[in-house]
């Protein structure tokens, strides 16, 4: 009988040790979670405060309605211009309306004057159709005024208040476009 009691006592003690271990593990886990929670909260706080302080467009970009525009200060060929825009999370300018065209040409007049600026328009070599970079067709009023007499690929650019076309391998300034951040605060 005494042996039985002693065995039960040992089993209870073993159970107690296991529970203490589990409690210790749980405490450690809780502490780890609390630390992670703190880190997450700090991260979110930072993100929120930077979002709160940030304007809809990055520095040196111009805003018009839901878009931000960047007018380059360097020349490059059309394909490199596209890559430069992608590095900034944007694409070459896609002009959707006459209003947008007027805004762009008006802004360019103020900034730089009458230079050439690549936009995201190119001519399909097979069909001769003009297409924006996302595959959509320009509205009839926004087709390049002159057809380039080039055997090479032909791309669109803005000069003064006109859309024109040129060999994609010529060097020009370029304009990038991205969506403006919506302020939800």
């Amino acid at each position: 009988k005494l042996l039985q009691v002693s065995t039960i006592a040992m089993q209870q003690q073993e159970k107690l040790i296991q529970q203490e271990r589990a409690l210790l593990n749980f405490t450690e886990w809780k502490r780890s979670c609390a630390l992670q929670m703190k880190y997450c909260q700090a991260f979110m706080q930072n993100s929120l405060s930077s979002a709160h302080n940030s304007s809809p467009c990055p520095n040196n970009w111009i805003q018009n309605r839901e878009s931000c525009y960047y007018v380059s200060e360097i020349w490059s060929i059309w394909h490199t211009s596209q890559e430069n825009c992608l590095k900034e999370g944007s694409t070459l300018l896609q002009i959707e309306s006459k209003e947008e065209m007027d805004f762009i040409t008006g802004s360019l007049r103020k900034i730089k004057g009458s230079y050439d600026y690549w936009v995201g328009l190119s001519q399909d070599g097979h069909s001769g159709r003009w297409l924006w970079q996302d595959g959509s067709s320009p509205s009839p009023g926004l087709l390049p005024a002159e057809r380039s007499q080039s055997a090479n690929q032909v791309c669109g650019y803005v000069k003064s208040n006109s859309l024109l076309s040129s060999n994609c391998s010529t060097w020009k300034y370029f304009i990038c476009e991205k969506y403006a951040l919506r302020s939800s605060v």
């Epitope: 890559e83 590095k87 900034e88 944007s90 996302d134 991205k178 969506y179």
Partner: nanobody, 115 residues
Framework: QVQLQESGGGLVQPGGSLRLSCAAS????????MGWYRQAPGKQRELVAA???????TYADSVKGRFTISRDNAGNTVYLQMNSLRPEDTAVYYC?????????WGQGTQVTVSS
């Protein structure tokens, strides 16, 4: 550093379809856009399609209307759906991540269009 892993390449008949995937890992918060390039033997590497974090897309003239680039909601995987494939689409397809300071490339996946 950003690591990129492509998959989905293979042999397909003209007119067929393939879907390429590119999974990004590492410092994915630095990525502003992701794109697909291709390089055929003896030719220069060319941009096929790209997508920005904001969802803007850009395509090479030769693939417009046939290829579609997209990304998952988390933004760390980009897909290239290639339809109506032609023999001239045969190339090694590379994934690229665009950041302000650096560009990161995947190892590439072979796409062969042949009957």
């Amino acid at each position: 550093q950003v690591q990129l892993q492509e998959s989905g390449g293979g042999l397909v008949q003209p007119g067929g379809s393939l879907r390429l995937s590119c999974a990004a890992s590492g410092r994915i918060f630095d990525i502003n856009a992701m794109g697909w390039y291709r390089q055929a033997p003896g030719k220069q590497r060319e941009l096929v399609a790209a997508i920005t974090n904001g969802g803007q897309t850009t395509y090479a003239d030769s693939v417009k209307g046939r290829f579609t680039i997209s990304r998952d909601n988390a933004g760390n995987t980009v897909y290239l759906q290639m339809n109506s494939l032609r023999p001239e689409d045969t190339a090694v397809y590379y994934c690229k991540a665009f950041t302000r300071s650096d560009d990161y490339w995947g190892q590439g996946t072979q796409v062969t269009v042949s009957s």
